[in-house]
Structure formats: structure tokens, C-alpha cells
């Protein structure tokens, strides 16, 4: 791989804490790091056919890190798509012109030097501009394991035209059964987008109990269709030695 400049071309970023080195000393090694993480927050890119896509992973490190790209977890070569692609090492970016539906997938930048490696994944969907079913960002909501009494936040990132209806559901049991007579799972509606529902893409659970463990579903629909993704919540009790000692003498039960 060609070596990109270690300067953040994208920004006047002066947040580096590295000290200037004199000519006769080697610079301190620095593992790769993102120089503009706020510019990487948009992970789901839903793009009409024929447009250009630019993904950026502005980074730095000492020595200069290398940059490479994967598609769906595999090495991504220019001959893997019609028209190839361009990697702009100076701006830590990959550019794909004239996208087509076969370009859909997950694109991962890997930035590495001998002291470390970092990566970031973008999700590309190639869409019709005309109304389409909702698209959900991969990996969200994410599985969570939390301690009893904690607060939990599940997030669901939605791209939809027209306006979507968002529901948060929890799989439950009724009379010991998870499946109803209609062969559909029993669910409880926890939240839905509406007049009284601010930030419908986020579900917050406060002071969770063990009974709240289970599968949570983000279900999004519009008049064209629907999409849903789920995550598991595991609520754990503190380890035995962490529990406060209540009894001061042994108690025997006959």
C-alpha cells in the first residue's frame, strides 16, 4: 500500500499531543488513531444509482499508517466492480463512481502501522429515489449485557422515504409459551413513534431487572414495506463476593 500523509488533510486538526522532535532523535511511536471521528459518524449511506460514493477514514500515527479497504470483510480490489474505485491516500478516502445495486455492502477501512490497527465500517445501500421500504443500519440495535439496576439504551438507525413508523417490541411469554395460536411470537409494544414519542430511534430502559432480559426488536414500517432487527439484553446479578453480607452467623435450615 502507498503511504498516506500522516497529516489530517481534511481538517485543521491541532489536537495532536506529540512533541516536536529534534533532528537526531527518532519520533515517538504512535499507534493509528482517528483524527476526525465526528466525520465518520454517518455509517449508513443510502445512495441513488449512478451517483458517487466517498467514504473517509481520516487518521494519523507514527510511523505513517497504511490504509486498505475491505468489502463485506474481504479484500476489495478495483476489478471487483465495474469502473473500479479510487483510493485517495492524502485524504484517507475511497471513491466509487456510478454506483450500481451490486455495490451494496459493508466497506471497512483498516488503518495500521507496526504499533496498532484500527478499523471502521460503512454500510452502503443503493436505492431507488422513488419511495422504498425502510433500511436499517446493520448491527443496530446491538446486544447488551448489563448489571442489575443499570440503565440501557438500544439504538436503531433508520433510512426511509416516506416517513416511517418505528416500534420497539419485546418478545414475551404468555402462559409459558413464546408463540401464539396464530404461529406468531408474542410481543409487547414498548414504544412507538407518535405525538408523545421523542427520538423514536432510541429505546431507553431504566433500572433494569432480570425479568427484562430477552429479545428486543426495532420494527420500522412505511406504506411500501417493513424491516426489523433485534438485539438481546442480558441482565446479570453482581458476583457473590460483591453482595453485601447480611447474615453475621451461619443459619441452618432443617
Amino acid at each position: 500500500d502507498a503511504l498516506p500523509s500522516s497529516e489530517d488533510d481534511d481538517d485543521d486538526d491541532d489536537s495532536s499531543s506529540e512533541e516536536k522532535e529534534t533532528d537526531n532523535t527518532k519520533p515517538n511511536p504512535v499507534a493509528p488513531y482517528w483524527t476526525s471521528p465526528e466525520k465518520m459518524e454517518k455509517k449508513l449511506h443510502a445512495v441513488p444509482a449512478a451517483k458517487t460514493v466517498k467514504f473517509k477514514c481520516p487518521s494519523s500515527g507514527t510511523p505513517n499508517p497504511t490504509l486498505r479497504w475491505l468489502k463485506n470483510g474481504k479484500e476489495f480490489k478495483p476489478d471487483h466492480r465495474i469502473g473500479g474505485y479510487k483510493v485517495r491516500y492524502a485524504t484517507w478516502s475511497i471513491i466509487m463512481d456510478s454506483v450500481v445495486p451490486s455495490d451494496k455492502g459493508n466497506y471497512t477501512c483498516i488503518v495500521e502501522n507496526e504499533y496498532g490497527s484500527i478499523n471502521h465500517t460503512y454500510q452502503l445501500d443503493v436505492v431507488e429515489r422513488s419511495p422504498h421500504r425502510p433500511i436499517l443500519q446493520a448491527g443496530l440495535p446491538a446486544n447488551k449485557t448489563v448489571a442489575l439496576g443499570s440503565n440501557v439504551e438500544f439504538m436503531c438507525k433508520v433510512y426511509s422515504d416516506p416517513q416511517p413508523h418505528i416500534q420497539w417490541l419485546k418478545h414475551i411469554e404468555v402462559n409459558g409459551s413464546k408463540i401464539g395460536p396464530d404461529n406468531l411470537p408474542y410481543v409487547q409494544i414498548l414504544k412507538h413513534s407518535g405525538i408523545n414519542s421523542s427520538d423514536a430511534e432510541v429505546l431507553t430502559l431504566f433500572n433494569v431487572t432480570e425479568a427484562q432480559s430477552g429479545e428486543y426488536v426495532c420494527k420500522v414500517s412505511n406504506y411500501i414495506g417493513e424491516a426489523n432487527q433485534s438485539a438481546w439484553l442480558t441482565v446479570t446479578r453482581p458476583a457473590l463476593e460483591e453482595r453485601p453480607a447480611v447474615m453475621t452467623s451461619p443459619l441452618y435450615l432443617e
Epitope: 441513488p48 451517483k51 473517509k56 485524504t91 422513488s130
Partner: antibody
Framework: QVQLQESGPGLVKPSGTLSLTCAVS?????????WSWVRQPPGKGLEWIGE???????SYNPSLKSRVTISVDKSKNQFSLKLSSVTAADTAVYYC?????????WGQGTLVTVSS | SYVLTQPPSVSVAPGQTARITCGGN??????VHWYQQKPGQAPVLVVY???DRPSGIPERFSGSNSGNTATLTISRVEAGDEADYYC???????????FGGGTKLTVLG
């Protein structure tokens, strides 16, 4: 090579509808491109009006959206612009163009004057 | 909607370097394209995808894009470069194309 040619009346009355057609020759309108209309009032800059894909999918400039319709006729290898309720402010040179993210091909442009 | 800001005019002597800027919020995340338009003619693409040149465009034309500013650089300016120059992006957030207001390049002398 591919060429674009605009056609339509050069004079439209106020409150009337401006109608233009762009003929695509030397290539197919069903290629992976967006077919656009761009206008330029006398002495002013370029203004994107809207665009259409061969599937019929469209996107319009929000400031003109309520008055604009762009359609495609694959059988004739052409696309059209209709702009309703025109006023003198719509007087401009109207260009058709072929684009992906950028425009690599333009028609020569046609001047449309809105006047009674 | 997304706004692209260009200086109305830039003047340069023949043989010098002209730089025309295009400002936009985090424009470095978009792909920027540049057009040259001479009086009475349709625009001509001179740079696309920030810094690529279509065939037939002299190497004197180059582009860069980072942060909040994209720049078209014309080195060794010639009298024939006198024209209006427009930047353009497809704004991925609004799904609309946007043009800058245009910059008139005057070649002095």
C-alpha cells in the same frame, strides 16, 4: 458519440407552461446516468432544476418542485421538462445534461423568454 | 439546503497561478466537480471527483478538496482560460445537486 439537443418554444406567456424536450442521440437513455435540466438566467449563474433516471425515478430542486415535472420516453430516447405557472423570472437559457455525480455532457442550450 | 460559496471574481496575470475556491459545510466529505463556461457556450467539465481531469483538459487544471473548502487551481494561466467557473456537488444529505454562484476569471493584460 452521444449528443443532446434541446427543443421547444422560445417564447412562453406568463402563467403558462414551459415545455422542452431533450433528444439523446448516439447512445441509450437507459444507461446508468441521470438526465438533467439546468437553467441560467441572463447574466446569472447555473441553477439545477431536476433530473430523471431511465426507471422514471426523479429528483427536483426544492425551490421549483411544486412547478416542475420531468419525464422520460425510452421509446423515443428522449426526456422532457414541464415548468408551470411561469413568470418573467423563469426567462433563461435551459440546458439538458447527462450526469452521474457530475455532468460530462451538455446540450447547447435554448433560450426561453417569458413575456406577453 | 446545502450552499456552495464562490468569490464573484478572480484576476490573474498571464503565466501566473489562479486559485478559485468553493466553500461548503464539510465539503471535504462530498465529491466536488468544476465547470468552465465561456460566453454564449454550454459549460464544460474541467475537474471531477475533487481532482480528476477529463480527457482533453490540460494538466494545468487541478483540484483539491478538504475540510470546508474545495479549490480549483489553474497554473500558467493563458488568455483562453478567461471564463466563468462553477463548482458543483451532489449533496448526499438532501439528495439534490447544487452549483456554486460562479467565479469570473479575468486574465489581466
Amino acid at each position: 458519440q452521444v449528443q443532446l439537443q434541446e427543443s421547444g418554444p422560445g417564447l412562453v406567456k406568463p402563467s403558462g407552461t414551459l415545455s422542452l424536450t431533450c433528444a439523446v442521440s448516439g447512445g441509450s437513455i437507459s444507461s446508468n446516468n441521470w438526465w438533467s435540466w439546468v437553467r441560467q438566467p441572463p447574466g446569472k449563474g447555473l441553477e439545477w432544476i431536476g433530473e430523471i433516471y431511465h426507471s422514471g425515478s426523479t429528483s427536483y430542486n426544492p425551490s421549483l418542485k411544486s412547478r416542475v415535472t420531468i419525464s422520460v420516453d425510452k421509446s423515443k430516447n428522449q426526456f422532457s421538462l414541464k415548468l408551470s405557472s411561469v413568470t418573467a423570472a423563469d426567462t433563461a437559457v435551459y440546458y439538458c445534461a447527462r450526469g452521474t455525480d457530475w455532468y460530462d455532457l451538455w446540450g447547447q442550450g435554448t433560450l426561453v423568454t417569458v413575456s406577453s | 439546503s446545502y450552499v456552495l460559496t464562490q468569490p464573484p471574481s478572480v484576476s490573474v496575470a498571464p503565466g501566473q497561478t489562479a486559485r478559485i475556491t468553493c466553500g461548503g459545510n464539510n465539503i471535504g466529505s462530498e465529491s466536488v466537480h468544476w465547470y468552465q463556461q465561456k460566453p454564449g457556450q454550454a459549460p464544460v467539465l474541467v475537474v471531477y471527483d475533487d481532482s480528476d481531469r477529463p480527457s482533453g483538459i490540460p494538466e494545468r487544471f487541478s483540484g483539491s478538496n478538504s475540510g470546508n473548502t474545495a479549490t480549483l487551481t489553474i497554473s500558467r494561466v493563458e488568455a483562453g482560460d478567461e471564463a466563468d467557473y462553477y463548482c458543483q456537488v451532489w449533496d448526499s444529505t438532501s439528495d439534490h445537486r447544487v452549483f456554486g454562484g460562479g467565479t469570473k476569471l479575468t486574465v489581466l493584460g
